[in-house]
Structures are given as structure tokens and as C-alpha cells.
Amino acid sequence: HNTTVFQGVAGQSLQVSCPYDSMKHWGRRKAWCRQLGEKGPCQRVVSTHNLWLLSFLRRWNGSTAITDDTLGGTLTITLRNLQPHDAGLYQCQSLHGSEADTLRKVLVEVLADPLDHRDAGDLWFPGESESFEDAHVEHSISRSLLEGEIPFPPTS
């Protein structure tokens, strides 16, 4: 599995999407887990509804939500109020009994809020790492615009 990078801004929400073959994984619950070290276990953060037919219902664990479009084949994870400690390697999983198939490996990067002028020295930025050389970056930076804010800087 290649690793897909999702970048979010500290304090904002980040949406991670994991596409999958809806028939191949039909009837299977899904989960979002955090990888503990490169070879360590993947610790479950949140999983979809116990009843597969209700997988579309959003389930929360703390600031992390999961919802599954079982017909379209897209698992969506929302990390609300993103914090530096949320950065790291995660997996979207398809569950089958006590087995878990990896749907996607995800590297979450937390960027400093450009409007936050506090010291950003403690924010985690991934260094160059061999395992992420082939990583596909999905720029998921999104935040709501403040009233009257210009979406893009004017061009001269």
C-alpha cells in the first residue's frame, strides 16, 4: 500500500477519504486506526456502526468521526479541531471477523494556522522519510473564511 498524505491546519477540521470497492467489502464494517511505530500494531481509534446497514451514521470517538458510504465505496474520517499530536500514520481498515484489511495508509500532517502568530516551533512537520517517498499528497487544507476575508491574495 502506498501512503496518502492528508494535510490539515491546526485548529481546523480535516477530512480523510478512503475509497474502496463496495462489492469486495460488502457487509464489512470499517475502522480508522493509528499506527504505533513503523512495525507496531494499529490501534483502533473509531469504527463504523455495529450494524453494517447503519454504517452511514456518523460515529464519534472524541474529536474523530467516521462514516461509510457503503454503496459508493467511500469511508470518510473527520478529525475535528486538529492538533499537532494528531499528526502521524493511520490506516483505513475493512473488518471481517477478527481480520482487518488495509484500505488505505494515511499520513496526517498538521500545518500551523497561518492566522495564529504564536510560536509554531512545537508543531510537528514530517521530515523526509524513505517510507513516504512515493506518498501521494492530497491537499486537504480547508478552513471557513472569516467574514469579509478575501479568499486569495490580490494579484498585482
Epitope: W26, G27, L51, H96, G97, S98, E99
Partner: antibody, heavy 122, light 108 residues
């Protein structure tokens, strides 16, 4: 009618190769996992492995890993089980079966082929 | 791997009687992932019960499944002549998928 039709009985010598087939019809072949099950003479059922014809994702039982190869050709809705070097102990009936996709319990074998008898004898 | 132990190995009963077949797992199985099959001589197995207690399409209601954890039961409430066969339980909770060794149901 949903069915799996397997190729006919085979008689082979030890050391020979063999590929048996399982053709699905009456349903979307690429959307269901297909499993292979061995039944040695007078014995029970043994799961060998499964394949998802949609993308050829294959899983093997540790007991059969490296002993057989499972493959599929989705263009003709057919799954295969093959041996490169047969042994006398491979003599058995081999069944292909479709994994059901009942919500909450995908994995039970709801449709079975009629079985292919493979005899390996010198 | 999960080992499924079926008992008894052979059960001899008469038509009209009640049959109770047991399947015990070496580890806890999610009920969703236990199935029962019937196999008659010279035929492929046939799915009877999935999710431990749900009857497959076309299976008569005299067949019922129950149990959870490590102990599962297939009950045939009133035996018909065509029910005499070999019955297998199967788990697909964990890879590799495993079957029990079977219970042979004979006519007494």
C-alpha cells in the same frame, strides 16, 4: 440461475501439472469472492483459499500456500485452481464456492460447484 | 487457527426424532461468522445456516441454529428421511477459514 460449473474429472500422474476451472453464471462474477475447498476421499472439508475476481486479490490457507495457485479470468467469469507438480496426496474432490455477501456475515459459501474429482496415481 | 470440534461424530436417529448437533470452537467466534452445511453422498455441500442462527434461502424451518462464543448448536426439530447426511460447521471469523470434521447423521 446462479451457478458455478466446474471442469470435469481428471486422472494424472505424479509430477504432472493441472489446472481446473470454475465458471460462474447468473450473477456478477467480479463482485463476489470465490473460494476453493478440498475433500479427500472419505474425509471432511478443507478451505484452501479465496480470490476476488474483481481485482484478483488472493488469500491462501497456510496449509496450501505454495502448493497451489488460485487465479481468475474475469473476462470469462472463471476461477482456476492449479498445481505445477501433482502428488498422490492431491487425490481429492475440489469444490469452488461463492462467498455470500449477506450484510454482517459475508463469507458463508452460499453457492457451490458440483466438484472436480482429481485422481493422481502412477 | 480456530479449531472446530463437532460432536457426536455419528448420530443414529429415526425419522420424526429431534437431532441436536454440537460445534465447539477453540476460541471465541463472533456469531456472525459461523455457518452450518449439509452434505449428502456424491453431492456438494449446501448452506443451511449463516450467522449462527439465520436460515439460508430455501432451508426448511425445521432446521435451526443457536449459540454464541465457543458453543454452537444445529437442531433439526423433526427428522425427515432426506435429512440423513453429514453436517459441517464452519467459521470465517479468522483466517484460515476452518470447518469442523463433521457429524454423520444416520438412520437408526
Amino acid at each position: 440461475e446462479v451457478q458455478l460449473v466446474q471442469s470435469g474429472a481428471e486422472v494424472k500422474k505424479p509430477g504432472e501439472s493441472l489446472k481446473i476451472s470454475c465458471k460462474g453464471s447468473g450473477y456478477s462474477f467480479t463482485s463476489y469472492w470465490i473460494g476453493w475447498v478440498r475433500q479427500m476421499p472419505g474425509k471432511g472439508l478443507e478451505w484452501m483459499g479465496i480470490i476476488y475476481p474483481g481485482d484478483s486479490d488472493t488469500r491462501y490457507s497456510p496449509s496450501f500456500q505454495g502448493q497451489v495457485t488460485i487465479s481468475a479470468d474475469k473476462s470469462i467469469s472463471t476461477a482456476y485452481l492449479q498445481w505445477s507438480t501433482l502428488k498422490a496426496s492431491d487425490t481429492a474432490i475440489y469444490y469452488c464456492a461463492r462467498h455470500d455477501i449477506i450484510p454482517a456475515a459475508p463469507g458463508a459459501f452460499d453457492i457451490w460447484g458440483q466438484g472436480t474429482m482429481v485422481t493422481v496415481s502412477s | 487457527e480456530f479449531v472446530l470440534t463437532q460432536s457426536p461424530g455419528t448420530l443414529s436417529l429415526s425419522p420424526g426424532e429431534r437431532a441436536t448437533l454440537s460445534c465447539r470452537a477453540s476460541q471465541i467466534i463472533s456469531s456472525n461468522y459461523l455457518a452450518w452445511y449439509q452434505q449428502k453422498p456424491g453431492q456438494a455441500p449446501r448452506l443451511l445456516i449463516y450467522s449462527a442462527s439465520s436460515r439460508a434461502t430455501g432451508i426448511p424451518d425445521r432446521f435451526s441454529g443457536s449459540g454464541s462464543g465457543t458453543d454452537f448448536t444445529l437442531t433439526i426439530s423433526r427428522l425427515e428421511p432426506e435429512d440423513f447426511a453429514v453436517y459441517y460447521c464452519q467459521q470465517f471469523d479468522s483466517s484460515p477459514i476452518t470447518f469442523g470434521r463433521g457429524t454423520r447423521l444416520d438412520i437408526k
